[in-house]
């Protein structure tokens, strides 16, 4: 099934001019994501039922091994490249989580809605980051890694991997919002 974010392996050929206050828009989107991250996390683990709500440290701890790194003290260009990688990773992961949750928790409509809304903001953020990288730094291609494919996991693993990812998302988005 299609994932919500397909990164562009492109040369710097931006079809539309970048938004005037691009960095402000990026900051605004990060703040928006940061402001809703905890609510999304709570909504997710509550929807999974036991044993998740009472075992958050064990089942939802942010120990995602292949998560792209971020260095808050880097240059703007370096930070934007790392942000791009993170947003791609989060976008594909969120796509997997949304797909799984539609099967595992078909009636958790508020969770589906919040996952979709988050994916929408990430899509916009990705577009803005790419625009900034292209227009200011002439970076048209960034090597990326994708979130883990949960297709072949059992029910418990699907739920656990989703919870760990959202735990990590909540943690990293706070760092990113602060860094920009």
């Amino acid at each position: 099934s299609p994932l919500p974010i397909t990164p562009v392996n492109a040369t710097c050929a931006i079809r539309h001019p970048c938004h005037n206050n691009l960095m402000n828009q990026i900051r605004s989107q990060l703040a928006q994501l940061n402001g809703s991250a905890n609510a999304l996390f709570i909504l997710y683990y509550t929807a999974q039922g036991e044993p998740f709500p009472n075992n958050l440290d064990k089942l939802c701890g942010p120990n995602v091994t292949d998560f792209p790194p971020f260095h808050a003290n880097g240059t703007e260009k370096a930070k934007l490249v790392e942000l791009y990688r993170i947003v791609v990773y989060l976008g594909t992961s969120l796509g997997n989580i949304t797909r799984d949750q539609k099967i595992l928790n078909p009636s958790a409509l508020s969770l589906h809605s919040k996952l979709n809304a988050t994916a929408d903001i990430l899509r916009g953020l990705l577009s803005n980051v790419l625009c900034r990288l292209c227009s200011k730094y002439h970076v048209g291609h960034v090597d990326v890694t994708y979130g883990p494919d949960t297709s072949g996991k059992d029910v418990f693993q699907k739920k656990k991997l989703g919870c760990q990812l959202l735990g990590k998302y909540k943690q990293i988005i706070a760092v990113l919002a602060q860094a920009f």
Partner: antibody, heavy 120, light 110 residues
Framework: EVQLVESGGGLVQPGGSLRLSCAAS?????????MSWVRQAPGKGLEWVSS?????????YYADSVKGRFTISRDNSKNTLYLQMDSLRAEDTAIYYC????????????WGQGTLVTVS | DIQMTQSPSSVSASVGDRVTITCRAS??????LAWYQQKPGKAPKLLIY???SLESGVPSRFSGSGSGTEFTLTISSLQPDDFATYYC????????????FGGGTKVEIK
């Protein structure tokens, strides 16, 4: 008609090897599907042995009793599931069933007729 | 590690009787439980999935209930064709130490 047909069972000595096959017809292995092996010792209950996701990732799962000795695999082009059984023991004697499950793989809605493996 | 315990291991009943079989999981499996019927020399047949959903073509006298750790299969009015062995199966976790199937319940003629 959707069907699973197992083959490859037979008599083997302890420590020996055997490879079971399960040919699927009526559906494609390229779909979002899990294939599994479930066994039943004579006069005993059902025991899950192993599962594999037939999609790209090919995730595999094994019961503790067979881990390190049995290997599950699939050939999507042939629509066939395999179980390579090495270091066989007397307690592996059973009818081996091939079973299929849809996402999220929480129940087996398709079963083969079974093939008998005797380790003696 | 999930352990599945089925009870009773056997039950003697007559045609028309109501039969209830219980399956307990050692930890929560949410509603991911299935029930199968098996007759001698045949492969298992799916009856109920996700604790209470009746598989297509299965008579409505079969019903399932429960969630979390305790589940039941009920045959409201036993028919001659129902004398068989019944198994519960958790579909929540397939880790190497998890028990997937219950031990089985043989329904015999009284």
């Amino acid at each position: 008609e959707v069907q699973l047909v197992e083959s490859g069972g037979g008599l083997v000595q302890p420590g020996g090897s055997l490879r079971l096959s399960c040919a699927a017809s009526g559906f494609s292995f390229s779909t979002d599907y899990w294939m599994s092996w479930v066994r039943q010792a004579p006069g005993k209950g059902l025991e899950w042995v192993s599962s594999i996701y037939v999609g790209t990732s090919g995730d595999t799962y094994y019961a503790d009793s067979v881990k390190g000795r049995f290997t599950i695999s699939r050939d999507n082009s042939k629509n066939t599931l395999y179980l390579q059984m090495d270091s066989l023991r007397a307690e592996d004697t059973a009818i081996y069933y091939c079973a299929g499950a849809d996402n999220p793989y929480d129940y087996f809605n398709l079963w083969g007729q079974g093939t008998l493996v005797t380790v003696s | 590690d999930i352990q599945m315990t089925q009870s009773p291991s056997s039950v003697s009943a007559s045609v028309g009787d109501r039969v209830t079989i219980t399956c307990r999981a050692s930890e929560t499996i949410s509603g991911y439980l299935a029930w199968y019927q098996q007759k001698p020399g045949k492969a298992p047949k799916l009856l109920i999935y996700r604790a209470s959903s009746l598989e297509s073509g299965v008579p409505s006298r079969f019903s399932g209930s429960g969630s979390g750790t305790e589940f039941t299969l009920t045959i409201s009015s036993l028919q001659p064709d129902d004398f068989a062995t019944y198994y519960c199966q958790q579909g929540y976790s397939y880790s190497d130490t998890d028990n997937v199937f219950g031990g089985g319940t043989k329904v015999e003629i009284k």
